[in-house]
């Protein structure tokens, strides 16, 4: 079953003047839900990991990045069906022989217990209770995230001379 | 729909101690070339724009974002064949009726001359001399970028308890 999709809000607002900067994100888009300082989208349909990554990108978001065990638990608590699995933004880097988040950081310890093989074309998904690896070509649901922190875009071309 | 909030990199360098953070990018990966503070990868194969976006994501990079006209010129100088075109990270947002970079910022002026239609499913590519729009489903080469600035990863899970 899916979590609710009510709108959510963020407390901090800032004055924004440049038109090229992104408007403040004052609430989560429809279909998304606020979980602390993130908006999360739990997909209903399924995709291979790479397509899930692309889908989040087209939504100007990222496959889920998990900060710590608390966030993992909070996210898993939103999964209401034991049989449902969701891709997250973690896969195995063959060249570096390590699990790697899509932001480039690595899992440096074994405190996150990933059940399954650590090998080429292995991607990570979460269920209600566990964290698993599976062939990245497998079709699964996925979770996109948008961070609610208000950030200034570094690249906002407004000076084409 | 609400705006989204893709993260961007920061200019300030910080001391790096945690092993889960991304190693300093001191030189460009193999096949990539350094252009000022970026590493660029000019694809050899072709893809629709969306697949190009996904490919850059899987390389932990972005479709090219162009800061100013100087950077456009520098990039075009690296294209040695007049007949070759490359997707960049700019497409038309129908809902916002504006050209939008994949980091969420907009083209706020008409100083960038895009030849072609500004309509749904229009994406932007560059050639040796010009900037064009074309149906996003068209297969073209593309350019990925990695920024050489040293940034601290916000999400680097290293405390799985």
């Amino acid at each position: 079953q899916k979590p609710s999709i009510g709108k959510c809000s963020v407390d901090i607002q800032q004055n924004r003047t440049k038109t090229t900067e992104r408007p403040d994100l004052l609430n989560c888009p429809i279909y998304w839900q606020q979980v602390q300082e993130k908006c999360l989208l739990f997909s209903h349909t399924v995709n291979p990991w790479n397509n899930s990554l692309a889908d989040c990108s087209t939504k100007e978001s990222s496959l889920l990045l998990i900060q710590d065990k608390d966030e993992l638990t909070r996210t898993q608590n939103l999964i209401h069906d034991k049989a449902i699995s969701f891709w997250i933004g973690l896969n195995f880097s063959l060249s570096e022989k390590n699990w790697k988040w899509i932001n480039g950081s690595f899992l440096s310890s074994n405190d996150l217990k990933i059940t399954g093989d650590a090998k080429e074309n292995s991607c990570v998904y979460i269920s209600q209770t566990s964290v698993y690896s599976e062939y990245c070509s497998t079709e699964m649901k996925w979770i996109c995230q948008k961070e609610l922190t208000l950030v200034r875009n570094k690249v906002s071309p407004d000076s084409w001379l | 729909q609400k705006p989204s909030i893709g993260k961007c990199s920061v200019d300030i360098q910080q001391n790096r101690t945690k092993t889960t953070e991304r190693p300093d990018l001191l030189n460009c990966p193999i096949y990539w070339q350094q252009v000022q503070e970026k590493c660029l990868l000019f694809s050899h194969t072709v893809n629709p724009w969306n697949n190009s976006l996904a490919d850059c994501s899987t390389k932990e990079s972005s479709l090219l974002l162009i800061q100013d006209k100087d950077e456009l010129t520098r990039t075009q100088n690296l294209i040695h064949d007049k007949a070759i075109s490359f997707w960049i990270g700019l497409n038309f947002s129908l809902s916002e009726k504006n050209w939008k970079w994949i980091n969420g910022s907009f083209l706020s002026s008409n100083d960038l001359k895009i030849t072609g239609d500004a309509k749904e499913n229009s994406c932007v590519y560059i050639s040796q001399t010009s900037v064009y729009s074309e149906y996003c489903s068209t297969e073209m080469k593309w350019i990925c970028q990695k920024e050489l600035t040293l940034v601290r990863n916000k999400v680097s899970p290293d405390s799985w308890l």
Partner: antibody
Framework: EVQLLESGGGLVQPGGSLRLSCAAS????????MSWVRQAPGKGLEWVSA????????YYADSVKGRFTISRDNSKNTLYLQMNSLRAEDTAVYYC??????????????WGRGTLVTVSS | DIQLTQSPSSVSASVGDRVTITCRAS??????LAWYQQKPGKAPKFLIY???ALQSGVPSRFSGSGSGTDFTLTISSLQPEDFATYYC?????????FGGGTKVEIK
């Protein structure tokens, strides 16, 4: 122009087969799960089948399971419905439908005009 | 499967009337409900999703409300072009299911 265009309907005898096609244009077809929905004459809407964006996952209504097969060719921007062992109760207008959001199965913001399938001897 | 029950099955109304159609789900579907309008011989038209979000281009006289199991579609001031059949649809789980429809007729 953003559109879906079904074809392949017609008159078929009970036990016969038909293959419906739905040609998509004006949007990134390969990003979206797609569905077939049907409507018997004078009746309401009935969801028939869905397929994931990449085509590897399919679902069917119990009423057509084992007889119908949904497929897609993303290189041709086309959705298909192969209908075998057709019955009189399969007589309906068949619509293909696209969801509003690429993460969803439903919330169909784009429908084709429909193609009529008549099963009769 | 989730059953959706619409009421009334038909309603007679005049131009300018306020019309309310209800849809009841057999189990909690949160806000995963959409509404469609269909005219004879035409494909359905998407009106509302996520229970209350108005699809782009749909007139503001249409509104949706509700959550959980009980939902409402309201047409605040009926226009001649609004005479049609209206369907609710749940988007929570497969199989996707539709309500039986409500026909809005001219009084």
């Amino acid at each position: 122009e953003v559109q879906l265009l079904e074809s392949g309907g017609g008159l078929v005898q009970p036990g016969g087969s038909l293959r419906l096609s739905c040609a998509a244009s004006g949007f990134t077809f390969e990003r979206y799960a797609m569905s077939w929905v049907r409507q018997a004459p004078g009746k309401g809407l009935e969801w028939v089948s869905a397929i994931s964006a990449a085509g590897g996952t399919t679902y069917y209504a119990d009423s057509v399971k084992g007889r119908f097969t949904i497929s897609r060719d993303n290189s041709k921007n086309t959705l298909y419905l192969q209908m075998n062992s057709l019955r009189a109760e399969d007589t309906a207008v068949y619509y293909c439908a696209k969801p509003l959001d690429s993460s969803q199965w439903a919330d169909f913001d784009l429908w084709g005009r429909g193609t009529l399938v008549t099963v009769s001897s | 499967d989730i059953q959706l029950t619409q009421s009334p099955s038909s309603v007679s109304a005049s131009v300018g009337d306020r019309v309310t159609i209800t849809c009841r789900a057999s189990q909690d579907i949160s806000s995963w409900l959409a509404w469609y309008q269909q005219k004879p011989g035409k494909a359905p038209k998407f009106l509302i999703y996520a229970a209350s979000a108005l699809q782009s281009g749909v007139p503001s006289r249409f509104s949706g409300s509700g959550s959980g199991t009980d939902f409402t579609l309201t047409i605040s001031s009926l226009q001649p072009e609004d005479f049609a059949t209206y369907y609710c649809q749940q988007a929570l789980v497969l199989p996707i299911t539709f309500g039986g429809g409500t026909k809005v007729e001219i009084k």
